[in-house]
């Protein structure tokens, strides 16, 4: 007995899709092995069509996929535009085509539905409208105009032109008898049900001369698209449910046990827990179409996922709907990264964000997640040298340590930095990851003071006091600006006095300053990394003024002043921050990057759209 | 809320036929399955046969021991999954349950399904 499963009999009809689901054993080598799909001929042979290693048979070509989810132990072969020549005895098995690793599947294509006797075919979507046509003749053209529907033996009136509507139909059906010169009238009924469905009868007349015709209303559940996306990446449900919806309240539902479609979220403001900090509903087109982003996802966002159109915001009745089978795949290419990272106020977080490393050269990008409305993901940093302006002096994103991961500083934390950020690329959109910054209560490591003054000509000593916890890490001081943190050369002084029950593995490193001239003026970070690793950071602005005495100065902690809430920022800065995101291929998918910054606070334009593993934000 | 009642057991001698019938009531949107099972007393419910659909398509699973002789169906005029079974032996003899799911899951697995009906009594004498 093989112990590989599936469906023995597959039923479908000519230009639908089946999506085949084979089972086997998932040991460490059946999940490895070469998976396929074949069809068996006459002889008792089995001509590969498609396998997992790659190959799909010129009959295949465009039309048909397999997937292999290792997993749980199935694979998945999809085949499109199916047509009656598909129809026969296959085999989807493991291994190779003539051992026994395998199971027989028969296929079964018939043909489409057509014209029958006279009757009119009518095959529309769930939640769609349909136009039946009527045509009469003359002598017909004043009498009474009907629709009715066969149930069981009997007809029922639905509709007819003087003025009666079955309640069933109440609300979304209507009568139009077009002008004069057409002898046509049309029923149109929206919002399909799966009920409405059936043979329908339109009349002219009522005596033996009227006029008949046949029609036979078939009402479609939407096909779900299958859809495979890794654990941790991102999925974008693109929900395109026509013009006549435009005005309509959108949502996505997922569905949970039989009928019903819990909310994920809708354009009411609706939004689940579960998806708080992860997803963004992008603005609908004119044409009522509208994307769904779901980023950081769990093996627990599997499942069937519906989008649809309804004034009350959720899946009703005769919704227009679209559906999809979110598969999410455990084996990973994404590696695990922390999805909270904790910091103190006054201190810093290092967060790691990972990217596809075949795309080492494109442009990163990090933007803190608002709930508001349907949520949006404003940007604030990138890899090319833009920072939002409130952020300058204190957020920096490094390329390092590369090969798939880069690094976003960002320090003098307060309470309103708490929330959820997303890394992200122009490059591949299933890598978005999503990230928690939690501010905790505690003290900065790291001790710096607050702003410096510095004297033109003079020399400047600015002093990083670093607890002994640090011990073992390469410590440094260098310059921000918008496009990273630039080493200097700094001063190991010896143990640092600032802390209480620390050895002498505490550490005073200082930052000296030459000859001070207006170029030395702004932020300095001192820092801990290992490696390309970096750690906690802490920021002090420098600013320069004319000479009073003569002299240098040294900055202790105790000489320290606040520092300054509002830097002005000089004219170049400006026109950086003011220049349009020219890349047209960032998030082109969701139409959210376009010249619509606000120029007074120099915003950059907005990704419009667990269990956590831990960080702290002081060590790695 | 679904529910699922089966109808259709009753007692017959080895090799001739019954009909079961699995009706569904309470809505349901896109994809369905259906899965037969049997439980025979003091043993483990186990898979009999299966059936899925999605828009025009649908598909088919039995257990190696009743292929050839079960055949399960769906008549969706009447909302019902028959399971036609011939040639009973003995062994085939146990309470018979439907279940459902919305979900694309391993049909052989009781635990797939979200919903169970009470279930009816088949018994075949020798």
């Known amino acids: 007995k093989s112990p590989i499963f599936g469906p023995e009999e597959v039923n479908s009809v000519e230009g639908n899709s089946v999506s085949i689901t084979c089972y086997y054993p998932p040991t460490s080598v059946n999940r490895h092995t070469r998976k396929y799909w074949c069809r068996q001929g006459a002889r008792g042979g089995c001509i590969t069509l498609i396998s997992s290693e790659g190959y799909v048979s010129s009959k295949y070509a465009g039309r048909a996929n397999l997937t292999n989810f290792p997993e749980n132990g199935t694979f998945v072969v999809n085949i499109a535009q199916l047509s009656q020549d598909d129809s026969g005895r296959y085999k989807c098995g493991l291994g190779i085509n003539s051992r026994g690793l395998s199971f027989d599947v028969s296929l079964e294509v018939s043909q489409g539905p057509g014209l029958l006797n006279d009757t009119k075919v009518y095959t529309v979507d769930l939640g769609r409208t349909v136009t039946i046509n009527c045509p009469f003749k003359t002598e017909n053209a004043q009498k009474r105009k009907s629709l009715y529907k066969q149930i069981g033996l009997y007809p029922v009136l639905v509709i007819d032109s003087s003025g009666y509507v079955n309640p069933n139909y109440t609300g979304r059906i209507r009568l139009d008898i077009q002008g004069t010169g057409q002898l046509l009238f049309s029923v149109v009924i929206n919002q399909l049900r799966l009920s409405d469905a059936g043979q329908y009868l339109c009349q002219a007349g009522d005596d033996s001369n009227s006029n008949k015709k046949n029609a036979d209303l078939q009402v479609l559940k939407p096909e779900p698209e299958l859809v495979y996306e890794d654990l941790r990446g991102s999925v974008t449900f693109h929900c395109a449910l026509g013009p006549e919806v435009a005005n309509v309240a959108k949502f996505l539902c997922r569905q949970s046990s039989g009928e019903n479609c819990d909310v994920v979220v809708n354009t009411l403001g609706k939004r689940a827990p579960a998806f708080e900090g992860r997803i963004l509903l992008n603005p609908q087109d004119k044409d009522g179409s509208f994307s769904v982003v779901i980023t950081g996802l769990r093996k627990e966002d599997a499942g069937r996922y519906l989008c649809g159109a309804h004034s009350d915001g959720q899946l009703q009745e005769g919704s227009p709907i679209q559906a999809w089978q979110l598969f999410v795949n455990e084996e990973s290419t994404i590696p695990r990264s922390p999805t909270v990272v904790k910091g103190v106020a006054g201190g810093s977080v290092a967060v790691l964000c990972p990217y596809n490393r075949k795309e080492s050269k494109s442009i990163k990008y990090w933007c803190l997640w608002e709930g508001a409305q349907n949520g949006r993901c404003p940007l604030l940093v990138d890899s090319e040298g833009w920072v939002k302006a409130q952020y300058e002096g204190r957020l920096s994103l490094l390329e390092e340590p590369g090969n798939g991961t880069f690094t976003v500083i960002l320090n003098q934390l307060t309470s309103r930095d708490a929330g959820f950020y997303w890394c992200l690329t122009n490059g591949d959109t299933l890598w978005r990851t999503t990230v928690e910054i939690k501010i905790i209560e505690g003290e900065p490591n790291l001790k710096v003071p607050g702003n410096v003054t510095a004297v033109l000509g003079e020399t400047l000593k600015v002093p990083c006091h670093f607890p002994c916890k640090f011990s073992s890490y390469e410590k440094y001081w260098c310059k921000w600006n918008n496009t990273g943190c630039q080493a200097l050369p700094s001063q190991d002084e010896g143990p640092s006095k600032a802390f209480v029950n620390c050895d002498e593995n505490s550490r005073l490193v200082s930052l000296t300053l030459n000859l001070v001239t207006r170029a030395d003026e702004g932020w300095y970070w001192c820092g801990v990394k290992q490696g390309h690793f970096y750690g906690e950071t802490a920021a002090v602005y420098v600013a320069v003024e004319e000479r009073k005495a003569a002299g240098s100065r040294d900055v202790s902690l105790a000489k320290a002043d606040a520092a300054p809430d509002e830097k002005v920022l000089d004219s170049g800065f400006r026109e950086i921050e003011n220049k349009a995101i020219q890349d047209p291929r960032l998030f082109a998918e969701e139409k959210a990057v376009a010249d619509t910054r606000d120029q007074a606070d120099g915003s950059r334009a907005s990704v419009d759209s667990g269990s956590s593993e831990e960080q702290g934000g002081s060590s790695r | 809320e679904v529910q699922l009642v089966e109808s259709g057991g009753g007692l017959v001698q080895a090799g001739g036929s019954l009909r079961l019938s699995c009706a569904a009531s309470?809505?349901?949107?896109?994809?369905?399955?259906m899965g037969w099972f049997r439980q025979a007393p003091g043993k483990e419910r186990e898979f009999v046969g299966a059936?899925?659909?999605?828009?025009?398509?649908?598909?088919?699973y039995y257990e190696d021991s009743v292929k050839g002789r079960f055949t399960i169906s769906r008549d969706n005029a009447k909302n019902t999954v028959p399971l036609q079974m011939n040639s009973l032996k003995p062994e085939d003899t146990g309470v018979y349950f439907c279940?459902?799911?919305?979900?694309?899951?391993?049909?052989?697995?009781?635990?797939?399904?979200?919903?169970w009906g009470q279930g009816t009594l088949v018994t075949v004498s020798s």
């Open positions: 309470g809505r349901t949107f896109g994809s369905y399955s």
């Open positions: 279940g459902g799911t919305m979900e694309r899951r391993d049909p052989r697995r009781t635990s797939a399904y979200d919903y």
């Open positions: 059936i899925s659909w999605s828009g025009s398509s649908t598909y088919k």
